[in-house]
Amino acid sequence: LPVNTRCKLEVSNFQQPYIVNRTFMLAKEASLADNNTDVRLIGEKLFRGVSAKDQCYLMKQVLNFTLEDVLLPQSDRFQPYMQEVVPFLTKLSNQLSSCHISGDDQNIQKNVRRLKETVKKLGESGEIKAIGELDLLFMSLRNACV
């Protein structure tokens, strides 16, 4: 079996009204504090050169970066949403822990690196932007991994 058969999430993860709503509320709260609307982290550029079958692996990398380097440093902000959404996203990350790809992941790493560099370059406002795009992260995980 190809390695990326493990790159799967159950659709039920994305059908729980309460936590879905909280995730989108968190994104909205953060996006109100984001005034750099010209920069988009999750969008077409992120998926450029990445085949559909590898997009879940790409999103796993983005999810892990978001959890470790964005949500944890900002964990005291945007309450009460943050304390509910972080465990939900951590659960998704754990479900993707065995998601790997066997082929060349050069484009994936390049695209993820570009996203990380953009967030780091923008500093705290980059972290706010990433939180404001949790709705896009949610949709991208759903589209790529279900």
Partner: antibody, heavy 119, light 107 residues
Amino acid sequence: QVQLVESGAEVKKPGASVKVSCKASGYTFTSYGISWVRQAPGQGLEWMGWISAYTGNTNYAQKFQGRVTMTTDTSTSTAYMELRSLRSDDTAVYYCARDRGYYDAFDIWGQGTLVTVSS
Amino acid sequence: DIQMTQSPSTLSASIGDRVTITCRASEGIYHWLAWYQQKPGKAPKLLIYKASSLASGAPSRFSGSGFGTDFTLTISSLQPDDFATYYCQQMGEWKAAFGGGTKLEIK
């Protein structure tokens, strides 16, 4: 300021083609895409398709598949929409609008181009 | 494809009225809904995106709400400049679909 300026009105015969242009200014053209929306006289808005100014990737509404071609010229920050095999019911105002194509609203619109198809 | 159903198709109201327009999606679209205002002979103008976020330059008397399949646009106190046609739009991934429109007329 950020704006989209479309080409002038066109009158075409049935069976002909029309190519409408949309020149962008005031923002980084390749950071967004362009959607095309049309509106027949007295009717509502109808989405035709989208093109990425970054990659040139396109996504057309099923109804226009095979009859429409959307292109961009990044050197002039201009998007184009060509519609072929025109019929009288293609008479409409054609709008270009800025969006990123990925769960994005259309925040900036062109002024519209009236295309009249008549024999 | 997702269908957007708007109601009512025509609405008569007076200056100062509170007005509500509804839009229903044929399947759940989370908060990916926008509202536009269009005046005769003019291009549409974005009012609300992501169901409830006010677009830059849009007056604060406009507000949006909803999640999933049912959405509303509310004008808290109708002004003379608000008589126009309003459209909802599903902000789908690479695809878009508009509602049929609601024409807001002076009573």
